[in-house]
């Protein structure tokens, strides 16, 4: 606890002090006082530098004195033999004695008192910037008129901070301008404009005179401008050294004027104004700016439109332009958006065709679609070549963005049929000779594939079974072979409206309009053993003449079995209808005269006993297309006959082309799975 005075005596004083002693005293007086330490008696073994015995006086880290020997007062009126005055409130006294004393030494007696210090004069560093006032136990600082004492209670300054300027135009000057500015001051001015305007400072050379820099180039007094993370200055000297106009690129500016204790000059005066924030005219490749201007400022809006074949990468799909606004921070909105080459993407795949993987899918790239030849061809033309257009679509010169359609090639067998004559009629055939041949297992019959979704057959084949099981692609209809062939599942059976349905079909004598269509659930995949037969054209070229040859095929009755396991076929000529009428109906169930013959029927056969028979019903009577000798069309469908091995009657398909097309069109919408 600090005291105002005190006494310090060596051990055993006034008796002789003992050997080998070390003792210390920590003196502390109250804050604001110094210490006056004085010795009234001193009798300590003398040695050089007081190496043996000594009393040491320490202030902080400084040794104020080291005493030994005997002392007596020089002043008869004062008992003081040695004294110390320190301007600090703490002092340490240390007494030491060594292991032996040749004589008897009595030590020392000392006293300390707290003394006032003059902080205003006693220290090298003046504690006050202006006026220093000492009092017992302390001091205080004071300021001249118009100055105020800072919070540190030592420094005086003028009240030049706190001004905030918000007007778009204004003038600011240093205190007392053009009279000398106050020393030891820090003046802070704030300019705060509306967002989107930058502060522009104008300072003429002659309006600036601030204490010059020292020899190291450091400003003693300085003017600094701070805008966000950007700083302009510090500036000092005679005449403004900075630019005439300072464009801060910010709506907020802090002005800091710092002065020291010496060298006051007239100071400075500046003007400022708010400029709408400029945005740079950026180079955005592959685009045009609307409107085009030399300079863009805050709130300006431009439309950036991509050149043809380029699009905006982000944002709306396929956008060709975007708007950008000059923002308050001097940056354009939507600056991340760029016009890049349109990417048409991976081209869509097509059924029964392919497209080579493109090297590039960007604007201008070219791709080619091809159909799976020779079983499919491109129906809608256009050559299959598409280029990546500016709108991001793959475009064909003829079809535009519409995809090519690969449809089955009709009427072209992979292998031509060659006859190998048998006893009554027909030869073994391969399904590749008749890839359109469809097998119905109940009743045992035939049909003709006319496209991916439709099978043409005779009405009498399906009238008793509206959900027939059909197979394609197999020469043999042995159960084990059928298991490996393609089974077709019907979705719906369409019997010609002119076909008369009977309660007892066995007694039928009228086979007029013996034609039906079966719509399949799933499309048939074409190949060497499965492909459709063409339909006849409607022109007179497709009118059959007597003697015209056609091919029939099927697994019906032959000269040696009730049904064939392997496909049979025969080539037979068209005959006059009377030839069929003249043949006696085998075991007629009705009067022979009751059998109906109409122009919707074709009579064919009669040569070498070649004929269709029970089990061939619904199969095609295939005739070479008069306009394309490589193709066959279904001129007829096996319908009925008076006797197997003579003449047979076939439904004349040409008379039903309109009904076929209409039925297929009206029922063409694919099922939704």
């Amino acid at each position: 606890e600090p005291t105002m005075y005190g006494e310090i005596l060596s051990p055993n004083y006034p008796q002789a002090y003992p050997s080998e002693v070390e003792k210390s005293w920590d003196i502390e007086v109250p804050e604001g006082y110094g210490i006056h330490l004085y010795f009234t008696h001193l009798d300590i073994e003398l040695s050089e530098n007081c190496a043996y015995d000594s009393v040491q006086i320490i202030s902080g880290d400084t040794e104020e004195g080291r005493l030994c020997g005997q002392r007596s007062s020089n002043n008869p009126h004062s008992p003081i033999v040695e004294e110390f005055q320190v301007p600090y409130n703490k002092l340490q006294v240390i007494f030491k004695s060594d292991f032996s004393n040749e004589e008897r030494f009595t030590g020392f007696a000392a006293y300390y008192v707290a003394t006032d210090i003059n902080e205003c004069t006693d220290f090298v560093d003046v504690p006050c910037s202006h006026f220093c006032n000492n009092f017992i136990g302390g001091y205080f600082c004071s300021c001249p008129p118009e100055y105020f004492l800072h919070d540190d209670m030592k420094n005086c300054g003028v009240n030049c901070s706190g001004d905030v300027f918000t007007a778009l135009i204004g003038e600011i000057a240093s205190p007392n301008y053009p009279k000398p500015y106050p020393e030891n001051s820090r003046c802070e001015y704030q300019i705060r404009l509306e967002k989107g305007f930058q502060v522009v400072v104008t300072l003429r050379r002659e309006d600036f005179d601030v204490e010059a820099a020292d020899s190291a180039g450091n400003c003693l007094d300085s003017l600094v401008f701070v805008a966000g993370d950007r700083q302009f200055g510090p500036y000092c000297g005679h005449g403004f050294p900075g630019p005439l106009n300072i464009e801060t690129k910010s709506n907020a500016l802090d002005i800091i004027f710092q002065t020291d204790l010496t060298g006051q000059k007239k100071g400075w005066k500046l003007r400022y104004h708010g400029d709408p924030m400029p945005c740079p005219k950026e180079d955005t490749p592959n685009s045009v700016w609307e409107p085009a201007k030399a300079k863009y400022v805050f709130r300006d809006v431009v439309q950036i439109t991509c050149l043809d074949g380029f699009e905006v990468v982000e944002g709306r799909v396929g956008a060709t332009s975007f708007y950008s606004t000059c923002q308050s921070n001097g940056k354009w909105s939507n600056s991340k958006l760029k016009c890049q080459p349109v990417d048409c993407g991976i081209p869509e795949s097509i059924e029964n065709g392919k497209v080579e993987d493109p090297e590039s899918t960007l604007f201008g790239s070219v791709i080619r679609y091809t159909c799976e030849e020779p079983y499919y061809y491109m129906e809608n033309g256009g050559g299959g070549e598409y280029h990546c257009a500016g709108n991001g679509s793959w475009v064909n010169e003829v079809l535009g963005p519409e995809l090519p359609k690969c449809v089955p090639v009709c009427g072209v067998p992979r292998e031509p049929f060659e006859e190998k004559q048998r006893i009554i009629g027909g030869s073994d055939a391969d399904i590749k000779n008749f890839p359109w041949q469809v097998f119905f297992d109940n009743p045992w019959a035939g049909g003709a594939l006319i496209n991916e979704y439709w099978v043409l057959t005779a009405a009498h084949v399906v009238e008793g079974n509206r959900e027939p099981t059909m197979y394609v692609g197999s020469t043999s209809v042995q159960t084990s072979r059928l298991a490996k062939s393609k089974m077709l599942t019907p979705e719906h059976v369409f019997i010609h409206p002119g076909w008369k349905l009977l309660e007892v079909p066995e007694g039928r004598t009228n086979f007029d309009n013996d034609i039906a269509l079966v719509r399949l659930k799933d499309p048939v995949k074409m190949g060497p053993t499965v492909s459709p037969i063409c339909l006849p054209g409607t022109s007179s070229d497709y009118n059959l003449m007597d003697g015209d040859l056609g091919l029939i095929s099927g697994w019906g009755r032959t000269e040696k079995r009730d049904r064939a396991v392997r496909l049979k076929a025969a080539r037979l000529p068209v005959a006059p209808l009377r030839k069929c009428k003249e043949v006696k109906v085998e075991k007629p169930t009705a009067d022979a005269e009751a059998y109906v013959f109409t122009p919707n029927m074709i009579c064919a056969g009669g040569e070498k006993g070649m004929d269709s028979c029970k089990g061939d019903s619904g199969g095609a009577f295939a005739v070479q297309d008069p306009n394309d000798k490589t193709k066959f069309y279904a001129a007829g469908l096996v319908s009925w006959g008076p006797q197997c091995g003579t003449y047979g009657l076939y439904t004349r398909v040409k008379n039903y082309v309109d009904w076929i097309m209409k039925t297929m069109q009206e029922n063409s919408t694919p099922r939704e799975d």
């Epitope: 048998r422 006893i423 009554i424 297992d441 109940n442 045992w444 159960t479 009755r557 000269e559 040696k560 079995r561 009730d562 049904r563 396991v565 006696k584 085998e586 075991k587 006993g609 029970k614 089990g615 006797q643 197997c644 091995g645």
Partner: antibody, heavy 121, light 105 residues
């Protein structure tokens, strides 16, 4: 009038062969298939095979492929069947039968009178 | 091969009685054919294409059926109908039934 005349009965030893003939008349021999059928008390009627007299095309029942050989002589309108490696199981009546197509398919329209083959040691 | 099963193996009927015998095929066939054989003679074609009567066959005979099930019917039994009747299929490799022996009571 159509007639199929078969050769007479045969008594043969096991392991030997026998040749049965079937002479036809009254129709076009080469126009129709000729069949051979075996009749035994145990197995009733069994089809052995068929031959197309026009081109000699033959189809056998798999069971008789190693047993029977069918041939024709077009000049005499005669069909033949040779049976080899005979055993007691081959003892039966053997028929030739012809198909005929006139106003429809007549399977086995005409039959021979049958030839009795007895295999005995 | 398609196996033909005839039933019954032996049956007898009184004169004027209706007679039905059946033949079942092991898998579906297109037609059934029937043959009549009297002792010591060759078989005769009797009914063909399931329901058609061969020439000279009395009208009291009829045939019917489809798929795997077929039958031969005599509407009114007569003494001359005593014989063995065989069914036969030619849809696949040719096979016969084991026969139904019909006797008069």
């Amino acid at each position: 009038q159509v007639k199929l005349q078969q050769s007479g009965p045969e008594l043969v030893k096991p392991g030997t062969s026998v040749r049965i003939s079937c002479k036809t008349s009254g129709y076009s021999f080469t126009g129709y298939y000729m069949h051979w059928v075996k009749q035994s008390p145990e197995k009733s009627l069994e089809w052995i095979g068929e031959i197309n007299p026009s081109i000699g095309d033959i189809t056998y029942n798999q069971r008789f492929k190693a047993k029977a050989t069918l041939t024709v002589d077009k000049s005499s309108s005669t069909a033949y069947m040779q049976l080899k490696s005979l055993t007691s199981e081959d003892s039966a009546v053997y028929y030739c039968a012809s198909d005929y197509y006139g106003g429809g398919f007549a399977w086995f329209a005409y039959w021979g009178q049958g030839t009795l083959v007895t295999v005995s040691a | 091969d398609i196996v033909m099963t005839q039933s019954p193996a032996i049956m007898s009927a009184s004169s004027g009685e209706k007679v039905t015998m059946t033949c079942s095929a092991s898998s579906s066939i297109n037609y059934m054919h029937w043959y009549q054989q009297k002792p010591g003679t060759s078989p005769k074609r009797w009914i063909y294409d399931t329901s058609k009567l061969a020439s000279g066959v009395p009208a009291r005979f009829s045939g019917s059926g489809s798929g795997t099930s077929y039958s031969l019917t005599i509407s009114s039994m007569e003494a001359e109908d005593t014989a063995t009747y065989y069914c036969h299929q030619r849809s696949d490799s040719l096979t016969f039934g084991s026969g139904t022996k019909l006797e008069i009571k």
